[in-house]
Interface confidence: medium
């Protein structure tokens, strides 16, 4: 599956777990494998394109979410979700534009 599809589905499911079930642990369980995939680095041109377009923002979001894990300061999670939402919107626009 393409990275943008995996991230789109993952952010959708993560938002369900957080905003629907209030399940922060489950949210992290969805997002962390996606971040690990990003961390391993791109192996195709499409993955390289994704990494260039969203990698920096997603890494920043991950840093905020990891900070929340240790700080329990809700503002850290707020910052992470601001970025995730922004990326989700961009992926959605790009995805709809090409389909």
């Amino acid at each position: 599956i393409l990275w943008h599809e995996q991230w789109h589905e993952g952010l959708e499911e993560a938002s369900r777990l957080y905003f629907g079930d209030r399940n922060v642990k489950g949210m992290f369980e969805i997002l962390e494998p996606l971040h690990a995939m990003l961390e391993r680095g791109p192996q195709t041109l499409k993955e390289t394109s994704f990494s260039q377009a969203y990698g920096r923002e997603l890494t920043e979001a991950y840093e905020w979410s990891q900070r929340y894990k240790t700080s329990a300061v809700v503002m850290d999670l707020d910052r992470a979700w601001d970025i995730y939402y922004h990326v989700f919107q961009k992926i959605s626009r790009h995805h709809h534009h090409h389909h």
Epitope: S15, V74, W81, Y85, F88
Partner: antibody, heavy 123, light 107 residues
Framework: EVQLVESGGGLVQPGGSLRLSCAAS????????IHWVRQAPGKGLEWVAS????????SYADSVKGRFTISADTSKNTAYLQMNSLRAEDTAVYYC????????????????WGQGTLVTVSS | DIQMTQSPSSLSASVGDRVTITCRAS??????VAWYQQKPGKAPKLLIY???SLYSGVPSRFSGSRSGTDFTLTISSLQPEDFATYYC?????????FGQGTKVEIK
């Protein structure tokens, strides 16, 4: 067409019980979130309780915790609010609302509401 | 609990006026804020979700914005059917909370 229809409201004495129903149609009820929101006469909106139809996980406002129970019957596409030990301050119009939680759905927000059912607690 | 402080509680305006209603969250709520319109005897209707996204079927004269924990609903040109009460609401944490409401009346 998405529809939510509440029923079960009425006049009840303090300390009494009532069960409200919220019949849903036009969407996949078994994977949805239903919330109850109330509005006292001439006042604002107050969130009461929520349930996930799939996991049955529930949440309650402190003002009703221990007295109200929210449940869902996926075979009937209906959510319920069992209200016990009712007080005068529970007098309100009770709305059930569908909660959408995910960014692609248009959430998190209440996108569809029922027409409301009036509960009056008075002796 | 997160308090949503809405202002003003009421306002008088004329058709064609630009109307702004604000809501301040007592703590961080990300963009998980929605705005609703309610008319007497009716259920609320969703206008804006995720702070600034216009809900399907809602006229484009309605818009929402966010600056930190401050949220704004703007009606660019008030129409006769817009006279109603407006509520903000946060979904960031349980309990979900609403603002006290703003009644928009005819001047």
């Amino acid at each position: 067409e998405v529809q939510l229809v509440e029923s079960g409201g009425g006049l009840v004495q303090p300390g009494g019980s009532l069960r409200l129903s919220c019949a849903a149609s036009g969407f996949n009820f078994s994977s949805s979130y239903i919330h109850w929101v109330r509005q006292a006469p001439g006042k604002g909106l107050e969130w009461v309780a929520s349930i996930s139809s799939s996991s049955s996980s529930t949440s309650y406002a402190d003002s009703v915790k221990g007295r109200f129970t929210i449940s869902a019957d996926t075979s009937k596409n209906t959510a319920y609010l069992q209200m016990n030990s009712l007080r005068a301050e529970d007098t309100a119009v009770y709305y059930c609302a569908r909660y959408v939680y995910s960014y692609s759905q248009g959430g998190p927000a209440f996108d569809y509401w029922g027409q409301g059912t009036l509960v009056t607690v008075s002796s | 609990d997160i308090q949503m402080t809405q202002s003003p509680s009421s306002l008088s305006a004329s058709v064609g006026d630009r109307v702004t209603i604000t809501c301040r969250a007592s703590q961080s709520v990300s963009s998980a804020v929605a705005w609703y319109q309610q008319k007497p005897g009716k259920a609320p209707k969703l206008l804006i979700y995720s702070a600034s996204s216009l809900y399907s079927g809602v006229p484009s004269r309605f818009s929402g914005s966010r600056s930190g924990t401050d949220f704004t609903l703007t009606i660019s040109s008030l129409q006769p059917e817009d006279f109603a009460t407006y509520y903000c609401q946060q979904s960031w944490s349980v309990p979900i909370t609403f603002g006290q409401g703003t009644k928009v009346e005819i001047k």
